[in-house]
């Protein structure tokens, strides 16, 4: 009997306790997932932290969906991680693809889920601490000591493949210091720090990152001694720091006391050269002088050398990144018109002094940047509004018509590549320079080009020959012009009509005013700028103008002879109105027929160099 | 009779502090945990806050939370709801009421009205 | 705006079966219980159902709750002129930690 009353009363007891203890719980509160982290990027673990409990026991659960997929998918393992933790392994875990996870709490009395977390293993990467750090004092003989650190990848991290990129950071301190020294050592595995304090005992730890992720924890800490005699020897660093001075001051003095001179008559001075007019081209071309005379300083004049007057007989033909020759009309870019250089309208254009045969260097060598675009990021630009109109000045027709210019707010009238037929070779700018010299002397018709800007000087009054037709000329020509806002936008190519030339005092170079069909060049004598006075372009002295290309020689010059018959021609404008164009034509194939034959007769092997005798020159003249 | 009174509504100017107090009898006060709830006039009914038995537990709702608080006093069987930084939108009727073991609101006050 | 939705308003002639809809999602009632509670006009509201179909002692037993997913239902039959209230749906809402109302839905008798 007493046996049942306690029982009973226990039995009522308990029912009251369970009755008002589950009368004064709630559901759970709300779960967070804070972390989720990847070792290696083939598994990864996911923690959260529950919400209250409301008092009850409360179960958790991680849900998780792929994106793109609807079905749910229960926490594979739940003991790896440790407490509220959900673990994916290598066969849950997929790479570039999206988890959508949730943690729902549950108690008696209700459900509670945290936020949804999205999750990519790539960015979710935290690797392991890296793995057997070695620290050591080193001191090599004469040089200053240092502390080397070496360490290992964390094992599960597979570097090999490529899959993995490490980052790792070092960081030191004396050991009763508080304050941390740290260095970042990218990918290396390896570490030299220098500038220790001698008798400190160090604590050196490493950690690693990978390219997208999170930094490990710090690997355990190594303890090194320094030892307390660690000395600095200084003598080698002395020695390399005088040794360098001294060099500084002589390349000073150096640039000083040539200041003035010519420094390429002083670095390579003039050699007696064959019976006639030439150089070297060899002789310069594997050296950057041009780049080395600048960084000291000496400015780009043109050199008093024995050669002065050379490019008056010699032509040179230069393909640098400074000059392109342009093929408006080709596959990328049909009928696409162009935006004129802006160059300054004056009529030096500095070659002279570019292209000196003295002055001679690599540039010519250099392979363009973009071999099939005429690259100069202010010239050329694709018409914004292709219904622009543009007036043409009939004034400025010359060449038999066949060249047009375009007005540039005045008088002044500027030549402007001419669009290919569409069968013309693709190429939108030539780069060879063989490719030139055989047009020069082929006989295709050549309308002038642009040149472009030229070491420091702007090329302002040149013009260079056209690149060759592979099919038959085509007649009619396709022409786009943009009318230029000032006569400072205009690229004179030509001078004017009234322009005065140069007087036949020793010559720079020469300047291309005309080319005809049968290749024949009209040039004029470029003054130098503290030339007398200038001479007008009726003077006898103009005679020479007129030249032949008689030839290419094999360093790609064009070899150039004064046209006896051209005599009494002024100036290029001048011609086109007084001589028949018939009659200058006849006497051209004449005169270069004669002088072809006989030039091949006349040439000599030099070293490499062709050279013409003059000897031959001058009987195939009378 | 199990009986749940409120008091301590009134007008306040948007920003003022006001406490809300919910005198409980007719139960043991000590073994429920308690809500309050608020009807904006016109309007739905809506969770405020909930406190658990012991007072170890708090939820609140989005609205309210950061500005009010809710607490308890066992040994007195009140609630209270301490409102601060009050807005024109938090004007309603609260109502005090107990949570029951299946997570129902069995047992409501008649409410005090608070208008800011 | 509520997490729960409910019709603004439902009607019935006496006697006749009317039903209120409750719908929510997977957080609130597609994982919790539903409670419905009616609120006469000027006093304060009364447990009409908990966990989804239980009566409270003292509610007749023409009023009537189900759950399917995430929805929820009361059902009303012989419905009487002393039915006419506001009726609310409420449910622990896991996602925020806290009970979720539904908007009330008035229930005119014709």
């Known amino acids: 009997m007493k046996e049942n009353v306690a029982s009973a009363t226990v039995f009522t007891l308990l029912l009251f306790l369970n009755t008002c203890l589950l009368n004064g719980q709630l559901p759970p509160g709300k779960p967070e997932i804070f972390k989720c982290r990847s070792p290696n990027k083939e598994t990864f673990t996911c923690w959260w932290r529950p919400g209250t409990d409301g008092g009850l026991p409360t179960n958790y659960s991680l849900t998780y969906h792929r994106e793109g997929e609807t079905l749910m998918h229960e926490c594979p393992d739940y003991i790896t991680g440790g407490p509220n933790s959900c673990h994916f392994g290598k066969q849950y875990t997929s790479m570039w693809r999206t988890y959508i996870m949730m943690v729902n709490a549950t108690n008696q009395m209700g459900s509670s889920f945290s936020d949804e977390l999205y999750v990519d293993v790539t960015y979710i990467v935290q690797p392991d601490p890296p793995l057997e750090l070695a620290v050591e004092v080193k001191q090599p003989e004469d040089r200053k000591p240092y502390l080397w650190i070496k360490w290992s990848p964390p094992t599960l991290i597979d570097l090999k493949t490529g899959w993995f990129t490490l980052l790792y950071e070092i960081r030191l301190k004396p050991e009763k210091a508080a304050e941390w020294e740290i260095h970042f050592a990218g990918q290396q595995t390896e570490f030299k720090i220098l500038s220790l304090h001698p008798g400190q005992k160090y604590l050196v730890q490493v950690r690693c990152k990978p390219d997208h992720g999170y930094w490990s924890a710090w690997s355990p800490a190594t303890f090194i001694q320094i030892p307390s005699d660690f000395t600095m020897n200084d003598t080698t660093v002395w020695i390399s720091v005088a040794v360098l001075s001294a060099v500084i001051c002589l390349i000073i003095v150096w640039a000083v006391a040539l200041k003035g001179y010519s420094m390429v008559t002083c670095i390579f001075p003039p050699v007696p050269g064959p019976k006639i007019k030439g150089f070297d081209a060899h002789l310069l071309e594997k050296g950057k002088s041009e780049e080395l005379l600048s960084a000291l300083g000496c400015q780009d004049f043109p050199p008093t050398s024995d050669y002065e007057d050379l490019l008056v007989e010699y032509l040179e033909v230069d393909d640098s990144e400074d000059q392109h020759l342009m093929s408006v009309h080709s596959k990328e870019h049909p009928s696409q018109g162009m935006k004129p250089t802006y160059l300054d309208p004056d009529t030096d254009s500095g070659r002279g002094s570019c292209d000196s045969p003295s002055l001679l260097s690599e540039k010519c060598e250099e392979p363009q940047a973009n071999p099939s675009t005429f690259y100069d990021p202010e010239v050329i630009e694709k018409p914004e509004n292709p219904e622009t109109t543009h007036t043409w000045d009939p004034q400025c027709i010359s060449m038999e018509g066949k060249i047009p210019y375009f007005h540039a707010g005045g008088s002044k009238c500027s030549t402007w590549p001419l669009p290919q037929p569409s069968q013309h070779n693709p190429r939108s700018s030539y780069h060879n320079i063989t490719d030139v010299c055989e047009l020069a002397v082929g006989p295709a018709g050549a309308p002038a080009t642009l040149l472009n800007e030229a070491g420091k000087d702007a090329l302002k009054s040149s013009q260079t020959i056209k690149s060759r037709e592979e099919g038959k000329a085509t007649q009619q020509r396709e022409v786009e012009s943009f009318h230029s806002e000032t006569d400072q936008d205009t690229p004179w190519l030509l001078p004017q009509e009234k322009t005065p030339f140069g007087s036949a005092k020793p010559l720079d170079y020469v300047e291309i005013h005309k080319v005809n069909k049968d290749g024949a060049l009209s040039l004029l004598p470029k003054q130098r700028e503290n030339s007398g006075k200038p001479k007008k372009p009726g003077t006898p002295e103009n005679n020479k103008e007129y030249a032949k290309v008689s030839g290419v020689m094999d360093n790609n010059i064009l070899v150039l002879v004064p046209d006896p018959h051209a005599k009494n021609v002024a100036c290029f404008e001048e011609s086109a109105k007084e001589a028949p164009p018939s009659l200058e034509q006849n006497q051209a194939e004449k005169a270069l027929a004669n002088f072809t034959a006989t030039s091949s007769k006349c040439r000599l092997q030099l070293g490499g160099l062709d050279y013409l005798d003059p000897a031959c020159f001058t009987h195939s003249f009378h | 009779e199990v009986q749940l009174l409120e008091s301590g509504g009134g007008l306040v100017q948007p920003g003022g502090s006001l406490r809300l107090s919910c005198a409980a009898s007719?139960?043991?006060?000590?073994?429920?945990?308690m809500n309050w709830v608020r009807q904006a006039p016109g309007k739905g009914l809506e969770w405020v806050a909930v406190?658990?038995?012991?007072?170890?537990?708090?939820y609140y709702a989005d609205s309210v939370k950061g500005r009010f608080t809710i607490s308890r006093d066992n040994s007195k069987n009140t609630l209270y709801l301490q409102m601060n930084s009050l807005r024109a939108e938090d004007t309603a009727m609260y109502y005090c009421?107990?949570?029951?073991?299946?997570?129902?609101?069995?047992?409501w006050g008649q409410g005090t009205l608070v208008t800011v | 705006q509520s997490v729960l939705t409910q019709p603004p308003s439902a009607s019935g002639t006496p006697g006749q079966r009317v039903t209120i809809s409750c719908s929510g999602r997977s957080s609130n009632i597609g994982s919790n219980t539903v409670n419905w509670y009616q609120q006469l006009p000027g006093t304060a509201p009364k447990l009409l159902i908990y966990?989804?179909?239980q009566r409270p002692s003292g509610v007749p037993d023409r009023f009537s709750g189900s759950k399917s997913g995430t929805s929820a239902s009361l059902a009303i039959s012989g419905l009487r002129s002393e039915d006419e209230a506001d009726y609310y749906c409420a449910v622990w809402d896991g996602s925020l930690s806290g009970w979720a109302f539904g908007g009330r839905t008035k229930l005119t008798v014709l």
């Open positions: 406190i658990s038995y012991d007072g170890s537990n708090k």
């Open positions: 009421a107990r949570l029951n073991r299946a997570g129902a609101f069995d047992i």
């Open positions: 007719g139960f043991t006060f000590s073994s429920y945990s």
């Open positions: 966990k989804n179909n």
